[in-house]
């Protein structure tokens, strides 16, 4: 009896795992084995597919074959007993196009009101994604174990922190990878669940801000309790995309280790040009807080976002304010190569009632002033970039007296 060729061959590729599945053509014939050959583009000869020779089941793995994943290949299969069936050819395919992204590995760290999620590709040093390893983005679905109401978070990187959670609550999540450049969406990881901890008696520091004074950065934050010590750590922001990188390590700012005030001062030359993340932790000697929310810190913007310098021309019922480039040490003006908005605050010297003007122009009129009255003015600059929402500190206040009446010209 002639053996029939196997049919319905499916090629499944997940990361670097190449699996073939097929249907037996004749279930009634026992002790049949199956063998595959493959052929690369531009070649005439067929080569035995290692791992898929004399297979008794209807599945085989040819992951050990070192293929160029961007090169088209063709497969053929036949059944064998005493004789052999004719070959059945499978449509040619390119492994990279066919491949799916496997489930990522997930490691969770619990805080009282946050979860830190560390995500890495499921296959280490994958050949399939060798050129795309740094292009992975991830999305996740998270839910409270008790409610099951799902929240989706898209476009996250290899390390992500979810805030504003409830203490002592079990949260579950699953993560999948995507390669947006290749329009590939991966397979979800298994579900991981973790319980947030009891509420920490010491809350994390809040409202972290960086400003510049002379040649130093001044880092300030708010804290609920007195008599605490604090430490500050930094990380290159780009490393959030790639925690596999051996440089991915939060590092101490030496001048901000075990500080006893809610600020620390460190030289600008601690950081080269770049974008960094900063975080602060509090300790009372016995207990330690969890880390604060991370703030983004861009040396380019921070270093040059100095308070504006301005001149005032006083009239009887208004001030004309002329804003100039701020001066660095050495009295050289700073070149601002990004758009700024100016916030001008003014008040009567004898009053606490402040008024505010927001203006894009560098010449500003402060109207509706009283003659022969001392007014004080201070100003600060803001970047107009939403992603890097930075503000300079306020300039020192300048106080001037308005002129007598009828000098508005």
């Amino acid at each position: 009896k002639n053996l029939k060729s196997p049919q319905k061959v499916e090629v499944d590729i997940i990361d670097d795992n190449f699996i073939l599945r097929w249907n037996r053509s004749d279930e009634s014939v026992g002790n049949v084995t199956f063998s595959f050959d493959y052929q690369k583009t531009g070649m005439d000869n067929w080569i035995k597919l290692s791992g898929c020779q004399n297979i008794t089941s209807t599945k085989c793995n040819f992951s050990s074959l070192k293929l160029n994943v961007y090169e088209e290949i063709k497969l053929r299969i036949r059944a064998e007993k005493e004789n052999t069936s004719s070959w059945y050819e499978v449509d040619s395919f390119t492994p990279f196009r066919k491949a799916q992204i496997g489930p990522p590995e997930v490691h969770l760290e619990a805080e009282d009101k946050a979860i830190v999620i560390h995500i890495s590709p499921g296959t280490k040093d994958s050949v399939m994604w060798a050129l795309d390893g740094l292009s992975f983005t991830y999305s996740l679905v998270i839910w409270k174990n008790s409610s099951g109401v799902e929240e989706r978070i898209e476009n996250i990187y290899s390390r992500h922190k979810i805030y504003k959670l409830s203490p002592e609550t079990t949260y579950c999540l699953k993560v999948k990878a995507a390669l947006l450049t290749s329009w590939k969406i991966g397979v979800y990881s298994p579900v991981h669940c973790i319980k947030t901890t009891v509420e920490n008696e010491l809350p994390p520091p809040e409202n972290i801000e960086v400003s510049v004074q002379n040649q130093n950065y001044v880092l300030k934050w708010d804290y609920t309790y007195a008599n605490m010590t604090f430490q500050v750590q930094w990380l290159h922001a780009f490393l959030k995309r790639n925690p596999g990188n051996h440089l991915y390590k939060w590092k101490q700012i030496p001048d901000c280790e075990n500080v006893k005030t809610t600020q620390c001062v460190f030289p600008q030359n601690v950081f080269q040009k770049g974008i960094y993340l900063l975080r602060v932790q509090a300790s009372d000697g016995n207990n330690t807080s969890f880390w604060s929310e991370e703030i983004k810190f861009d040396t380019e913007i921070q270093a040059f976002l100095l308070p504006p310098v301005f001149n005032i021309r006083s009239l009887s019922d208004s001030f004309h304010i002329y804003i100039g480039a701020p001066k660095q040490s050495g009295n050289t003006p700073v070149i601002q190569d990004y758009p700024l908005i100016y916030e001008i605050i003014f008040w009567e010297n004898t009053s606490n009632a402040e008024r505010k003007i927001i203006e894009k122009k560098t010449d500003v009129t402060v109207p509706n002033l009283k003659p022969l009255t001392v007014y004080c003015v201070k100003a600060r600059a803001h970047t107009m970039d939403e992603k890097l929402n930075k503000s300079s500190v306020f300039s020192d206040a300048v106080c001037e007296k308005t002129k007598p009446g009828n000098t508005s010209k």
């Epitope: 490691h107 760290e109 619990a110 805080e111 009282d112 830190v116 560390h118 390390r159 973790i194 319980k195 901890t197 009891v198 920490n200 008696e201 925690p243 596999g244 051996h246 991915y248 390590k249 939060w250 016995n286 207990n287 330690t288 969890f290 880390w291």
Partner: antibody, heavy 123, light 107 residues
């Protein structure tokens, strides 16, 4: 698979130093903290300190700070723990143990351990 | 330093018994607690991390629970290979500290 292989047993005189090695394989050596834990005969476990093999940053138990040195050789994926000014109470089995990933926000448990090195301090 | 107090220090039980070992920390350790099993002449083996997470390859009869300062290791049905010494360890604050151990013996 992850393996930590330690150097052989040592007998030392009081006042001498001992240097124990721990060779790691089966994972990315520079991505995980390496810890040292000791256990005196019939006693419990005592954490001595840890080293980051990527940049040699160390954290020590204050009890050992003045006497312990931890180093690493990335070319051979080996960490070393040297204990100086030995005394009889330093007689113990010394273990290296892998800690958490260096990229983690917080410390982690010790998931793989070496087989231990017995150091005997006797005059 | 954070003190870890394990109880009992020794325990006799029979195969099939349910056994509970407790560990108390002097400060809140926010679930940064591990349980290890050690057999004579061998290195400790990690059973549970994060107070409740069973390490891969560890039989499901082992489980961990607790939060704050109070943690528990439970073996639901003792097997002959479970007779050993068990240690808890906190890794919230340095120096990491271990409990004094619980020796589990055959009754």
């Amino acid at each position: 698979q992850v393996q930590l292989v330690q150097s052989g047993a040592e007998v030392k005189k009081p006042g001498a130093s001992v240097k124990v090695s721990c060779k790691a394989s089966g994972y990315t050596f520079t991505s995980y903290w390496m810890n040292w834990v000791r256990q005196a005969p019939g006693q419990g476990l005592e954490w001595m300190g840890k080293i980051d093999p990527s940049d040699s940053e160390t954290h020590f138990n204050q009890k050992f700070r003045d006497r312990v040195t931890m180093t690493r050789d990335t070319s051979t994926s080996t960490v070393y723990m040297e204990l100086s000014s030995l005394r009889s109470e330093d007689t113990a089995v010394y273990y290296c143990a892998r800690g958490g990933r260096i990229s983690f926000d917080y410390d982690a448990a010790l998931d793989y351990w070496g087989q231990g090195t017995l150091v005997t301090v006797s005059s | 330093d954070i003190q870890m107090t394990q109880s009992p220090s020794s325990l006799s039980a029979s195969v099939g018994d349910r056994v509970t070992i407790t560990c108390k920390s002097s400060e809140v350790i926010y679930n940064r607690l591990a349980w290890y099993q050690q057999k004579p002449g061998k290195a400790p083996k990690l059973l549970i991390s994060g107070a409740t997470t069973l390490e891969s390859g560890v039989p499901s009869r082992f489980s961990g629970s607790g939060s704050g300062k109070d943690y528990t290791l439970t073996i639901s049905s003792l097997q002959p290979e479970d007779f050993a010494t068990y240690y808890c360890q906190q890794y919230w604050n340095k120096p990491f500290t271990f409990g004094q151990g619980t020796k589990l013996e055959i009754k």
